[in-house]
Amino acid sequence: GQNITARIGEPLVLSCKGAPKKPPQQLEWKLNTGRTEAWKVLSPQGGPWDSVARILPNGSLLLPATGIVDEGTFRCRATNRRGKEVKSNYRVRVYQIPGKPEIVDPASELTASVPNKVGTCVSEGSYPAGTLSWHLDGKLLIPDGKETLVKEETRRHPETGLFTLRSELTVIPTQGGTHPTFSCSFSLGLPRRRPLNTAPIQLRVREPGPPEGIQLLVEPEGGIVAPGGTVTLTCAISAQPPPQVHWIKDGAPLPLAPSPVLLLPEVGHEDEGTYSCVATHPSHGPQESPPVSIRVTETGDEGPAEGSVGESGLGTLA
């Protein structure tokens, strides 16, 4: 038999070999497709099947607009002018090329040594489903489950039967300072069909480095509090994932569970001192904040102590 590939919605003509080009003709077309449960013999006189498969005057079979349900086998049996029986057998598959794939929610930059979501590649309206592949600097990226992770999802439209594919790429770049280019391509897996490519995205890879701007916020401002009052120290750090935060008072670690917030309720003179927070990030060592000074005083008429919090509420080094 012959394999035929037809685009969804397009007409397809299958010739009946050996059939005389004009009536009288002795021929029989039968089909076994998604529209049938077994073999359906088409009436030469035509009928309700003509909208999907119609015998033409020359004996050929016309499928006016092929659909997914027309995939299957088509057979013609004809008697030629010399009385010899000739058979034709076709295996029909249909396809639909989707729209150009797109990378949605692309990253703005990547950080070395940690997992980074590059983006999600989306292809809509394919048949059969096909596949999405990622490329790095023009070379096929093979997911290894460690440095390169791909999460895939395939959905089928309940009415059209066409597929939507999504592929989310996560990578762990080994070193900073590079500018890798990522792209994604869709392939139907049919012969003579070139893949469809997304526009490439070029991303900067930065070294993990210390988190930018570890800051110690104190409430009340200035770090001066009356006896019995409450002091709240907050370690603000712009790092993902959030690091573990420990607290130091007068150079010694406080025996507390890690937390970005230190609450000192009902303070007394024993709580006075210099406080700082230490953030420990998995990809780099500990980083200590500038210290702040806490003073417990009966009256609030003293100016800010050296190294305490100024108007901004941010701990700064004097």
Epitope: T36, E37, K40, S43, G47, P48, D50, S51, V52, R54
Partner: antibody, heavy 119, light 107 residues
Amino acid sequence: EVQLVESGGGLVQPGGSLRLSCAASGFTFNNYWMTWVRQAPGKGLEWVASIDNSGDNTYYPDSVKDRFTISRDNAKNSLYLQMNSLRAEDTAVYYCARGGDIRVGLDVWGQGTLVTVSS
Amino acid sequence: DIQMTQSPSSLSASVGDRVTITCRASQDVGIYVNWFQQKPGKAPRRLIYRATNLADGVPSRFSGSRSGTDFTLTISSLQPEDFATYYCLEFDEHPLTFGGGTKVEIK
């Protein structure tokens, strides 16, 4: 709303002619086959004629072949049935229906128009 | 030509009854059968398409089934508005053929 409205029915003498019309609205007319079905008084339903979406191919049962002609004007969203050589047994309510091929069957029907053939 | 033999031609039933109507095709028509409901002086209304699929807006008490060339319309719990005449139609071959109809009357 999908709607089919028949017109043109009436009283006609045996041997006479009549032309029925069906105005379609609420759907893309040229995407569908169209069909005429009739129902004699107190009787069941009988297929009369079908036409494909382009109007190139028409289909009839033996009972009306060579006497009735189905046609369509896709620009006017209209279906027609030209009935010639009418007989008493053609007396019926004539319904216009959407479909007639295996994709649809018959899904939407008009309200019908009565044709009476009598002398 | 295909014959669609519909039975019974009439039946009497009460509100709440389960009603079954059958059409037998004289040859294989695949799934290409519709069921219609018709009330006096009105056009037929499609209930079931392609043997088993409920048409839009049709109550779920109506269902269609198929076994080979036998097609069945079932009304699980008859309602007052269901008293009408029911027809099957095969649309696999020309001539398109309707069953003779089943009149469902109040007992």
